[in-house]
């Protein structure tokens, strides 16, 4: 469960095409995507542009998740990870494509 969260819910893009900003995608209790960025000193980002995963701070309590899961019995099974299904509202405008890392030349890694 935690692994699924850490893998899918808090991705850093370590290698923006033009600067050293780290962009963070987190998802709040209402399923809204929150994008933020801060600058890192040069040299602190690996050349390989590894994707770093963080468990987001804004994940709801287990009681909230239970409520959401039980109340949502009419919602269809998602194609996303089960861990995400409990958190994400269907109107969340976030796709895995949008939170994939971007390499120095601006391309998505394969």
């Amino acid at each position: 469960f935690r692994k699924a969260f850490s893998t899918l819910l808090g991705c850093y893009r370590l290698c923006p095409a033009t600067n050293n900003a780290i962009e963070t995608v987190s998802i709040n209790n209402n399923g809204a995507a929150m994008f933020s960025s801060h600058h890192e000193p040069r040299g602190s980002i690996s050349k390989e542009c590894n994707l770093v995963y963080l468990i987001p701070h804004a994940v709801g309590s287990s009681e909230d998740l239970k409520k959401e899961e039980a109340a949502g019995i009419a919602r269809p099974l998602e194609k996303l990870s089960p861990a995400l299904s409990v958190i994400l509202d269907y109107d969340t405008d976030v796709s895995l494509e949008k939170i994939q890392p971007i390499t120095q030349n601006g391309q998505h890694p394969t």
């Epitope: 209402n30 009681e63 239970k66 409520k67 959401e68 899961e69 039980a70 109340a71 949502g72 019995i73 009419a74 919602r75 269809p76 099974l77 089960p82 861990a83 299904s85 409990v86 509202d89 269907y90 109107d91």
Partner: antibody, heavy 108, light 113 residues
């Protein structure tokens, strides 16, 4: 994904009955499943839900009369002491994945 | 306990016409949008049409449209076809800590002429 109910039959009032919902392609450790019923010629009713953690929730009218439990591939509904009012088609499912239903007839 | 009141109980529509079904909840559904619409034909399992009040389920015709929020919801069927003859149910999801987790409306029978 697929869901199929079984165990429906003719029972006498007061005779406990367990219905089984067998799922395929649904990870019950990740998703909730519900039990519903429909009396002949009547509307749909929600009986209860079991969520991924195993926590169960019941309709107020169903508490004490029905018990939901699960294994990795099945979700059971136990009717502790059926009455004639429990005669209905019982469905198991969630969202867009429901079984075809199983008919329970309670009659002496 | 929550009550979902569907109106009308029965409606007749001509092929090509439009049908509107209302579902009024006695209390707000979870997150104001945990409301689904199901279609059921005699002897068949219910089929999900709409979830989260307005989202079309996979494989469902865009002639079906859901709208509403909180306690008032509507299912609209446009360009009605013979195959739309069925009973339609709304299903609300609620905060289980203060109410039943789910409740159905009483159903609306759609007859197509």
């Amino acid at each position: 994904q697929s869901v199929e109910e079984s165990g429906g039959r003719l029972v006498k009032p007061g005779t406990p009955l367990t219905l089984t919902c067998t799922v395929s392609g649904i990870d019950l450790s990740s998703y909730a499943m519900g039990w519903f019923r429909q009396a002949p010629g009547k509307g749909l009713g929600w009986i209860g839900t079991i969520i991924s953690s195993g926590t169960t929730y019941y309709a107020r009218w169903a508490k004490g009369r029905f018990t939901i439990s699960k294994t990795s591939t099945t979700v059971d509904l136990r009717i502790s002491s059926p009455t004639t009012e429990d005669t209905a088609t019982y469905f198991c499912g969630r969202g867009d994945t429901w079984g075809p239903g199983t008919l329970v007839t309670v009659s002496s | 306990a929550q009550v979902l009141t569907q109106t009308p109980a029965s409606v007749s529509a001509a092929v090509g016409g439009t049908v509107t079904i209302n579902c009024q909840a006695s209390q707000s559904v979870y997150k104001n949008n945990y409301l689904a619409w199901y279609q059921q034909k005699p002897g068949q399992r219910p089929k999900l049409l709409i979830y989260d009040a307005s989202k079309l389920a996979s494989g469902v015709s865009s002639r079906f449209k859901g709208s509403g929020s909180g306690t008032q919801f509507t299912l609209t069927i446009s360009d009605v076809q013979c195959d739309d003859a069925a009973t339609y149910y709304c299903l609300g999801g609620y905060d289980c800590s203060s109410a039943d987790c789910s409740a159905f409306g009483g159903g609306t029978e759609v007859v197509v002429k």
